[in-house]
């Protein structure tokens, strides 16, 4: 209309999707009577009457707003509930008297998008790709208006860069009117990006101001060629025979190339391929000294068939050879002397020790053990231990048995055995001597004999307890070329008075009556020998 003042900018009302918008009619009393107002929505420059106010009473017009409008604030404010993105438009109120004036309100609608959903390229990216490859996608669903996406690498925003970084985004409108933003980051990556952290950020606005949401951080599988190959040996440090040793081939490429491990043959001067497991690891278990040598790894790129060779690695499996003792089976008369010599080879300096087998007592530090004025008790085992002090656990031993010539020597001279009449008794008798003695019994029964060692024998006798046996007792006799000796077992009947708590009898009484074959063990379990004069 000519001469009409330019329309003022509409009042801005900002509201979130789903909430209620309060549209306050800003007409002054001079511009119109608020008890007589028409409300319109304006969409694509088309006005639609949506609400009438007459004498302060409101009435919705049929249509999309019919159920969502109500009057507030004594008729000055129109409340629009359950706001949707489609409600983002101009609303105007028009007073009817004294002259038609209107007041315009611009409704702005906002909704925060959902958390951005980032998906990384599951197949990975080669560093030598001809153009930027798809690194990751980012989806921000159900935002309004369209959020802005920013991609980050290691916390720094990524900018479009020709032939290096390209960000492609698109949006779709859902039936709700909300936007779903989709973005894909394309980039040319380098080897150093294998540990890079990527994420996307959605920037959006709400009535309360600007906001942002970040996706989780992702790393991208980056493929790059192998430049260096090397060998690693586990365990680190000095190796010894018997260890489990793993020789592993490693490369700085991704994916790892195909590996083969070979060992130099000193005699042919050629490398021989070793059999590795599925992971390309050569396992030596148990490691032997023959495994010592020079190892190297060859890595093959199966695409280019280019191979790389590692630096050779010397492997030393430390060992101690079998220990040899001379003489190997010494025999000596009482009173004589003996020199025992121990020998062994090793990849390292050796230490020798001589120990008494029965007691583990160290007799000598060194390879030679000298024994003088040999007594009968000197018979038995002597152990030479050859060890490498610098490698714990690397040692070998050899046992030698010294035999002292002499008549049989009984483990006990006499013993009391508690018995019950008519029980089957299991008696045992032990003797030693050189030459090895044999044992006989003075009563009938089932006897069995077993070697304890070359100079010692154990005989067991199963016999029925009879009154006669109780009377006579039992004798065992050990004999060899140099003499004989006897042990006596006295049999005593059990009665209740015998079994007093303070009884210090240590002979083997069986109180079992369930079986007639109860064992009454008369074997001395202690090698504490009586005085020599008590021997027969």
């Amino acid at each position: 209309v000519p001469g009409e003042a330019e329309q003022p900018a509409p009042e801005l009302v900002e509201v979130e999707v789903g909430s209620t918008a309060l549209l306050k009619c800003g007409l002054s009393q001079s511009q119109g009577n608020l008890s007589h107002v028409d409300w319109f929505s304006v969409h694509k420059e088309k006005r639609t009457l949506i609400f009438r106010v007459r004498q302060g009473q409101g009435q919705s017009e049929p249509g999309e707003y019919e159920q969502r409008l109500s009057l507030q604030d004594r008729g000055a404010t129109l409340a629009l509930t359950q706001v949707t993105p489609q409600d983002e438009r101009i609303f105007l109120c028009q007073g009817k008297r004294p002259r038609s004036q209107e007041y315009r309100i611009q409704l702005r609608v906002y909704k925060a998008p959902e958390e951005p959903n980032i998906q990384v390229n599951p197949l990975g990216i080669p560093v030598n790709s001809k153009e930027p490859e798809e690194v990751a996608t980012c989806v921000g669903r159900n935002g309004y208006p369209i959020p802005q996406v920013i991609w980050y690498k290691n916390g720094r925003p990524l900018k479009e860069e020709k032939n290096r970084v390209h960000i492609q985004s698109s949006q779709t409108v859902e039936s709700s009117g909300l936007y779903t933003l989709q973005s894909i980051l394309k980039a040319q990556l380098v080897k150093e990006d294998k540990d890079a952290q990527f994420y996307c950020e959605l920037n959006y606005r709400l009535p309360s101001g600007n906001h942002m949401k970040e996706s989780r951080e992702v790393t991208v599988p980056v493929f790059y060629p192998t430049e260096k190959v090397w060998l690693e040996v586990e365990p680190v440090g000095m190796l010894k025979e018997g260890d489990r040793v793993e020789i592993r081939c490693l490369a700085d490429g991704n994916p790892p190339p195909h590996f083969s491990i070979s060992k130099g043959n000193p005699s042919t001067r050629e490398a021989e391929e070793e059999t590795t497991n599925d992971n390309g690891v050569l396992v030596l278990e148990p490691a032997r000294k023959e495994h010592s040598g020079r190892y190297e790894c060859q890595a093959w790129n199966l695409d280019t068939m280019i191979s790389l060779l590692s630096e050779p690695q010397e492997l030393l499996v430390n060992y101690v050879s079998d220990v040899r003792v001379s003489p190997a089976a010494p025999e000596r008369q009482e009173g004589s002397s003996l020199t025992l010599t121990c020998e062994a080879e090793s990849s390292q300096d050796l230490e020798f020790q001589w120990l008494r087998e029965e007691t583990d007592q160290v007799l000598e530090r060194g390879p030679v053990l000298q024994l003088h004025d040999l007594k009968r008790e000197a018979g038995g085992g002597y152990r030479c231990v050859a060890s490498v002090p610098s490698i714990p656990g690397l040692n070998r031993t050899q046992l030698v048995k010294l035999a002292i010539f002499g008549p049989p020597w009984m483990a006990f001279k006499e013993r009391k055995v508690w018995v019950k009449e008519n029980m089957v008794l299991n008696l045992s008798c032990e003797a030693s001597g050189h030459p090895r003695p044999t044992i006989s019994w003075n009563v009938n029964g089932t006897a069995s004999e077993g070697d304890q060692d070359p100079q010692r024998v154990l005989s067991t006798l199963n016999v029925l307890v009879t009154p006669e046996l109780l009377e006579t007792g039992v004798e065992c006799t050990a004999s060899n070329d140099l003499g004989k000796n006897t042990s006596i077992l006295f049999l005593e009947l059990v009665n209740l008075t015998t079994l007093t708590p303070d009884s210090n009898t240590t002979t083997g009484l069986s109180t079992s009556t369930a079986s007639p074959h109860t064992r009454a063990n008369s074997t001395s379990t202690e090698r504490k020998l009586p005085e020599p004069e008590s021997r027969g």
Partner: antibody, heavy 118, light 106 residues
């Protein structure tokens, strides 16, 4: 609209090489990646190989040494070759388009059944 | 490689039933999972992507949920055309599919 169509021999002999072609329409091979997926009779789906929109090739490591995937963007074709075929390779072979803003397959060809038999 | 295990391997149900199919990943795949429907002699068709997003044109009776290692496809009210085999697929590291769940009419 988006379509993908597989073509190639229905029967190959053991040890021979299989060549399959996927002809696409309704989209450009420079905007979407294409994968090959196979399905032996009565069995599950198995991804074989892919070529990205940028032309990078990817293979299932179980078949890697036997596979080659390539494309001809001017003909809108993706070609898969698989050497040293075996009766266990008998399957329906599908080509599938990778969704442009995701990593799943939004359009598939109808598939072609390849039988390996002497 | 990531393994995907579906259960059950087969399932009988009636029209109108609510049906749930589960898929378990051998390691955390976040929400990098899609569900496909395949009918005999036909190619698979994507239903759900990113674990819970409904593909355009797919009826809203289909829904997906889960994250990490455990995922579910739910059909709220079975229709006659829903009887088919359903596959899950991970796209977190490479591509692997579940062994399938055959949904049959009871």
């Amino acid at each position: 609209q988006v379509t993908l169509k597989e073509s190639g021999p229905v029967l190959v002999k053991p040890t021979e090489t299989l060549t399959l072609t996927c002809t696409v329409s309704g989209f450009s091979l420079t905007s979407n990646g294409v994968s090959w997926v196979r399905q032996p009779p009565g069995k599950a789906l198995e991804w074989i190989a892919a070529i990205s929109s940028g032309g990078t090739t990817y293979y299932n490591s179980a078949f890697k040494s036997r596979l080659t995937i390539s494309r001809d963007t001017s003909k809108s074709q993706v070609v898969l070759t698989m050497t040293n075929m075996d009766p266990v390779d008998t399957a329906t072979y599908y080509c599938a388009r990778r969704y442009g803003y995701g990593w799943y397959f939004d359009f598939w060809g109808q598939g072609t059944l390849v039988t390996v038999s002497s | 490689d990531i393994q995907m295990t579906q259960s059950p391997s087969s399932l009988s149900a009636s029209v109108g039933d609510r049906v749930t199919i589960t898929c378990k990943a051998s390691q955390n795949i976040y929400n990098s999972l899609a569900w496909y429907q395949q009918k005999p002699g036909k190619a698979p068709k994507v239903l759900i992507f990113n674990a819970n997003s409904l593909q355009t044109g797919i009826p809203s009776r289909f829904s997906g949920s889960g994250s990490g290692t455990d995922f579910t496809l739910t059909i709220s009210s079975l229709q006659p055309e829903d009887f088919a085999t359903y596959y899950c697929q991970q796209f977190y590291s490479g591509y692997t599919f579940g062994q399938g769940t055959k949904l049959e009419i009871k």
